[in-house]
């Protein structure tokens, strides 16, 4: 089953003048009528190139969406084609008809010539269920770490009121199914699951009815587990620096921890003309590590005030937790105080990298 | 067993630093919170902050902010609130409570729930 | 900061009485209201979350309903057990903030 589907009953045609601009008419369709919506020219005049815009987008023309300057036609329409639909001139964006179009599950009755008055007969009052917010319900994946609460809501209306029912991976879903249970809420038209699991994972359903018709909505859940690592440090940083003589630098390193992570930073030297030891290991000297009153948050900095030439070379941090290792370097790069900044960036281009 | 331990408090002078612990066990802490709530003598619950270990991130009381910072060793399951910058009106006992998020759908807010709590450890913070 | 306010800021009441305390917040927080009970000397004990959802473990005689800005506390026959000091918190805002309390007391 796809992220997010809503079930649609197909079934017929009505045909419905514009409303006067300025006027928002609210229409109500049968599924699988065919919704035609009028909008001619206000006072009569020249209308100009129009654009046809359902929920704030453009409407593209298909086998399904026929469109016209002046009218717009749905065939087939589903609850999908519910919505706020306008024309507006192309060019100025202004709105020449304004539509509120609901399509209920009741199929038409009556004449189908008679357009205006099927719309009527089909009436707000009675009707099958729609979605009071469906702008709230695009979000269809819900990513949860194990041990939190989910929540799934389905709020929607209809006369008479809807029941709503649940389905985990399309069968019938109740508390007995979960260790922990479920907590419904039919006045909120919520599913509560405490201390979710791996095993909740999938794909839970929202069946909404009554007499008139359904509508359903299926949301993935996908419960995340820790799994332990080393710590991660951002891409990019520490990042090479080039600095005059005298003036002062930042290297910057951000880590990403489970476990409290023990964050140094090195600077290699050169011992006897050589920068690493027998064992290939590098040499280095502590500038900075964690002491007593140290946070974090000053550790994943290193300042270098009134810079020297001594003070080029390699810079490293380190961080290290009960998983492991990891460590990015950079390098720093010292330029006489006379040499111009343009002079400066070239040579921090040759150290880049 | 959910237990939440707090240590630390104690009496410390204005302008000076302290570090309360909150030993969490019972649970999977790195899936979870912990919410620091104080509670000045004979006043009502005042919420300090929260870290939240899936991602290490923190948030704070404006009362707080910028003198507290909420910190954790998930190899040890347990969180730290740093204090530093005392002052008189910080005297409370303090405590720490598990918290766990309520995702919803619907929602672009995640509900936080504190459901349960520490013993409470006092700072007192006078010269 | 969105604030809370309870009411009544103590009542008394004896064993047995239908007890209502309300909690109402400077804007819309939606469901999203817990309420904490704590005696004298204890951490907060939490009974209700997302304004109406029981708690594991706390008894049937607490209830909690509302959204938006207006929530109420009800305990439905008081025990001796629940003489304590009530607290509503709301947490869609930030930073998550407690009403002032709630005492009831034995009358």
């Known amino acids: 089953e796809s992220l997010g589907t809503e079930q649609r009953v197909v079934g017929r045609a009505a045909e419905v003048p514009g409303p006067e601009p300025g006027q928002q008419e609210q229409l109500v369709f049968g599924s699988g009528d065919a919704v035609e919506l009028s909008c001619p020219p206000p006072g009569g005049g020249p209308m100009g190139p129009t654009v046809w815009v359902k929920d704030g987008t453009g409407l593209v023309p298909s086998e399904r969406v026929l469109v016209g300057p002046q009218r717009l036609q749905v065939l087939n329409a589903s609850h999908e084609d519910s919505g706020a639909y306008s024309c507006r001139q192309r060019l100025t964006q202004r709105v020449l008809c304004h539509f509120s179009v609901r399509v209920t599950d009741a199929p038409s009755s009556g004449d189908d010539e008679d357009g205006e008055d099927e719309a009527e007969d089909t009436g707000v009052d009675t009707g099958a269920p729609y979605w009071t917010r469906p702008e709230r319900m695009d979000k269809k994946l819900l990513a949860v770490p194990a041990a939190n609460t989910v929540r799934f809501r389905c709020p929607a209306a209809g006369n008479p009121t809807p029941s709503i029912s649940w389905l985990k991976n399309g069968r019938e879903f109740r508390g007995e199914h979960r260790i922990g249970g479920i907590k419904l809420r039919h006045q909120q038209w919520s599913l509560v699951m405490e201390s979710v699991v791996p095993s909740d994972r999938g794909n839970y359903t929202c069946v909404v009815e009554n007499k008139f018709g359904s509508i359903r909505q299926t949301y993935t859940l996908d419960v995340l587990e820790r799994s332990p690592h080393r710590p991660i440090l951002q891409a990019g940083l520490p990042a090479n620096q080039t600095a005059v003589l005298g003036s002062d630098v930042e290297f910057h390193c951000k880590v990403y921890s489970d476990a409290q992570p023990h964050i140094q930073w090195l600077k290699h030297v050169e011992v006897n003309g050589s920068k690493v030891g027998p064992d290939g290991t590098p040499y280095v000297t502590v500038l900075k590590t964690a002491g007593a009153n140290t946070t974090d948050k000053e550790l994943e900095v290193l300042s270098l005030h009134n810079v020297t030439f001594e003070d080029a070379g390699e810079y490293t941090c380190l961080a290290g937790n009960s998983i492991g290792f990891s460590h990015h370097s950079a390098w720093l790069v010292v330029l006489p105080a006379e040499e111009e900044l343009v002079e400066a960036d070239e040579a921090g281009s040759v150290y880049a990298g | 067993e959910v237990q939440l331990v707090e240590s630390g408090g104690g009496l410390v002078q204005p302008g000076g630093s302290l570090r309360l612990s909150c030993a969490a066990s019972?649970?999977?802490?790195?899936?979870?919170?912990i919410s620091w709530v104080r509670q000045a003598p004979g006043k009502g619950l005042e919420w300090v902050g929260r870290?939240?270990?899936?991602?290490?991130?923190?948030n704070y009381a404006d009362s707080v902010k910028g003198r507290f910072t909420i910190s954790a060793d998930t190899s040890k399951n347990t969180a730290y609130l740093q204090m530093n910058s005392l002052r008189a009106e910080d005297t409370a006992v303090y405590y720490c409570?598990?918290?766990?998020?309520?995702?919803?759908?619907?929602?672009?807010?995640?509900?936080?729930?504190?459901?349960?709590w520490g013993q409470g450890t006092l700072v007192t913070v006078s010269s | 900061d969105i604030q809370m306010t309870q009411s009544p800021s103590s009542l008394s009441a004896s064993v047995g009485d239908r007890v209502t305390i309300t909690c109402r917040a400077s804007?819309?927080?939606?469901?999203?209201l817990a309420w904490y009970k704590q005696k004298p000397g204890k951490a907060p004990k939490l009974l209700i979350y997302?304004?109406?959802f029981l708690y594991s473990g706390v008894p049937s005689r607490f209830s909690g309903s509302g959204s938006g800005t207006d929530f109420t506390l009800t305990i439905s026959s008081l025990q001796p057990e629940d003489f304590a000091t009530y607290y509503c918190?709301?947490?869609?805002?930030?930073?998550?903030?407690f009403g002032q309390g709630t005492k009831v007391e034995i009358k």
């Open positions: 409570a598990r918290t766990y998020g309520i995702y919803d759908i619907y929602e672009k807010y995640t509900e936080y729930v504190m459901d349960y």
């Open positions: 019972g649970f999977p802490f790195t899936s979870l919170g």
């Open positions: 870290y939240w270990a899936w991602d290490g991130s923190t």
């Open positions: 804007q819309d927080v939606d469901t999203s």
């Open positions: 997302s304004a109406s």
């Open positions: 918190q709301q947490s869609t805002g930030h930073p998550q903030t």
